[in-house]
Interface confidence: medium
């Protein structure tokens, strides 16, 4: 994946100091915490007669640095010390001998905020380009993982759930994936930017929370996404059911009341009984389900319970908090940030006048 350039390029050429030494670089770049950015940069300098065969060294310094005293944040000079806090994260990616001063920043941290200037040295030709400087802005990590559920979840059938952070960059420290779920699970393979969870759901796992947590250790920042599992009950008679799927294989989510009212002349008492039974089972077992951390895709496993925020139990209940089967829709109460998966039974179309909004679990 290409490095993220999160601001339009604001190019500037330095002509104020010495028109023979000039540099083109965007004056401002914004990067989200934990992510990375490549800042294109070109500089020019005349090569005097006495330095034509000398190697070119480039340096990026923090604004206000004193060249003779302070270390650069990045350089191509092998024996030059760099700032400890930027070591391995800031790289002079460009080749100064080709007039390229491009700077790469990975695992961006809050303290990277600030302005930086470039300096070139070629033999006895030395110049600090004090204008334009590069201003780096590190903002909150607002990107969140995507959780992909292929097809529908059925009790007793294993499915591979994928948590991906496609917006992360290849060059950074690989993130640490953690999964939190009450359902029986095991860890599948992982790539740099995704982790697979193998889940074998039970009927009582319907409506329980599943969280994918991604930690960018290089910057010490974490992001997560939580969904509610939609475990679909498939009866013995495949022609009988409620809410047939649209065949898209998408895991649907909805907020608010899940409509489960029964209607239509063709609906039998058996179906109503079936729905009532399922509701009762879910209600009973749901309260017993405790959310547990099922695994981390990293090389540094950690122990300890999930945070208090993650220990909240979600409730699935009817309007009167009884187990009566009146046909009234059960409601879903969750943290505001959660995405809600619908009760999605096979066999019957929902009423057309529903005002419930749908959104895919595969969100931004």
């Amino acid at each position: 994946m290409p490095l993220l350039l999160l601001l339009p390029l604001l190019w500037a050429g330095a002509l104020a100091m010495d028109p023979n030494f000039w540099l083109q670089v965007q004056e401002s770049v914004t990067v989200q915490e934990g992510l990375c950015v490549l800042v294109p940069c070109t500089f020019f300098h005349p090569i005097p007669y006495y330095d034509k065969n000398s190697p070119v060294h480039g340096y990026w310094f923090r604004e206000g640095a004193i060249i003779s005293r302070d270390s650069p944040v990045a350089t191509n000079k092998l024996d030059q010390e760099v700032q400890e806090e930027t070591q391995g994260r800031f790289r002079l990616l460009g080749d100064p001998s080709r007039n390229n001063c491009s700077l790469s920043i990975v695992d961006a941290r809050r303290r990277d905020n600030g302005s930086y200037f470039f300096r070139m040295e070629r033999g006895s030709t030395k110049y600090s380009y004090k204008s334009p400087q590069l201003s780096v802005h590190v903002t909150d990590l607002t990107h969140r993982p995507k959780i992909l559920i292929p097809g529908t979840l059925e009790p007793g059938h294993s499915k591979n759930l994928t948590c991906s952070v496609s917006w992360a960059c290849e060059q950074g420290t690989p993130p640490i994936f953690s999964w939190l779920s009450a359902a029986p699970t095991s860890l599948g393979p992982r790539t740099t930017h995704s982790s697979v969870l193998i889940i074998t759901p039970r009927p009582q796992d319907h409506g329980t929370n599943l969280t994918c947590q991604v930690k960018f250790a290089g910057a010490g920042v974490t992001t997560e996404r939580t969904i509610q599992l939609n475990v679909t009950y498939v009866p013995q008679n495949p022609t009988t059911g409620i809410f047939p799927g649209d065949g898209s294989g998408k895991q649907e989510t909805r907020a608010g009341v899940v409509h489960g009212a029964i209607g239509g002349a063709g609906v039998t008492a058996l179906l109503a009984l079936c729905l009532c039974l399922i509701f009762f089972i879910v209600k009973t077992h749901r309260r017993k389900a405790a959310r547990t951390a099922v695994g981390r895709n990293d090389t540094h496993p950690t122990t300890g319970s999930a945070s208090p925020k993650h220990q909240k139990k979600s409730k699935l209940h009817g309007p009167t908090e009884t187990s009566s089967c009146s046909g009234a829709a059960p409601t879903v109460e969750m943290d505001e940030e959660l995405h809600y998966a619908s009760l999605n039974f096979h066999g019957m179309n929902p009423s057309k006048d529903t005002s419930t909004e749908y959104s895919e679990v595969r969100t931004q």
Epitope: N20, F44, P46, P48, Y49, Y50, G123, S124
Partner: antibody, heavy 117, light 111 residues
Framework: QVQLVQSGAEVKKPGASVKISCKAS????????YHWVRQAPGQGLEWIGF????????GYAQKFQHRATLTVDNSTSTAYMELSSLRSEDTAVYYC??????????WGQGTLLTVSS | DIQMTQSPSSLSASVGDRVTITCRAS??????????MHWYQQKPGKAPKLLIK???NLESGVPSRFSGSGSGTDFTLTISSLQPEDLATYYC?????????FGQGTKLEIK
């Protein structure tokens, strides 16, 4: 302001040596190169050589390789040119000039050297 | 060594005239980004003064009637509208390699 002030006129006999000074002020002396250029009466400009104070690098025109010696005293921000084995054809105005990189942006006022028996 | 040949050696022009002085190097003094050619003005009894650096860059404080052009081996100094104070000798100089060398000069007189 930037200034290069050279020592006064010199009259020397053939075979002698002369040392001309060029005192800089108004900027950081060691950030620049110092060149020496001479101009014989009614003639054009002739480059002698240069010195870079920060690392002592020097360069000379082949004609002056063995007769000219360029030095600096960083403590007094002064550049020097010593020319030995003087001949009558060395009679000229000698200029010191400051160079950031390639071109000469400031020049001294010149020092007239007369070599005569 | 790189030889620099200026032409003409001298010229006389009237105030307001457009004046062109050329300088030819015995080998190219241009790289991809820069041409290592500079122009100086020397008035009688004075030290030379930088006019143009890197073939076409006007030194700060120099009147805009002066301009420079060229690359490779052929370079030109132009005075778009000659003024009385432009009476001087003009020199080109390369900085491609050691030794640095100057052209022999072009003496400009005012008619």
């Amino acid at each position: 302001q930037v200034q290069l002030v050279q020592s006064g006129a010199e009259v020397k006999k053939p075979g002698a040596s002369v040392k001309i000074s060029c005192k800089a002020s108004g900027y950081t002396f060691t950030d620049y190169n110092y060149h020496w250029v001479r101009q014989a009466p009614g003639q054009g400009l002739e480059w002698i050589g240069f010195i870079y104070p920060s690392n002592g690098i020097t360069g000379y025109a082949q004609k002056f390789q063995h007769r000219a010696t360029l030095t600096v005293d960083n403590s007094t921000s002064t550049a020097y040119m010593e020319l030995s084995s003087l001949r009558s054809e060395d009679t000229a105005v000698y200029y010191c000039a400051r160079s950031d990189v390639d071109y000469f942006d400031y020049w001294g006022q010149g020092t007239l050297l007369t070599v005569s028996s | 060594d790189i030889q620099m040949t200026q032409s003409p050696s001298s010229l006389s022009a009237s105030v307001g005239d457009r004046v062109t002085i050329t300088c030819r190097a015995s080998q190219s003094v241009s790289a991809s980004t820069y041409s290592y050619m500079h122009w100086y003005q020397q008035k009688p009894g004075k030290a030379p003064k930088l006019l143009i650096k890197y073939a076409s860059n006007l030194e700060s404080g120099v009147p805009s009637r002066f301009s420079g052009s060229g690359s490779g081996t052929d370079f030109t100094l132009t005075i778009s509208s000659l003024q009385p104070e432009d009476l001087a000798t003009y020199y080109c100089q390369h900085s491609w390699e050691i030794p640095l060398t100057f052209g022999q000069g072009t003496k400009l007189e005012i008619k």
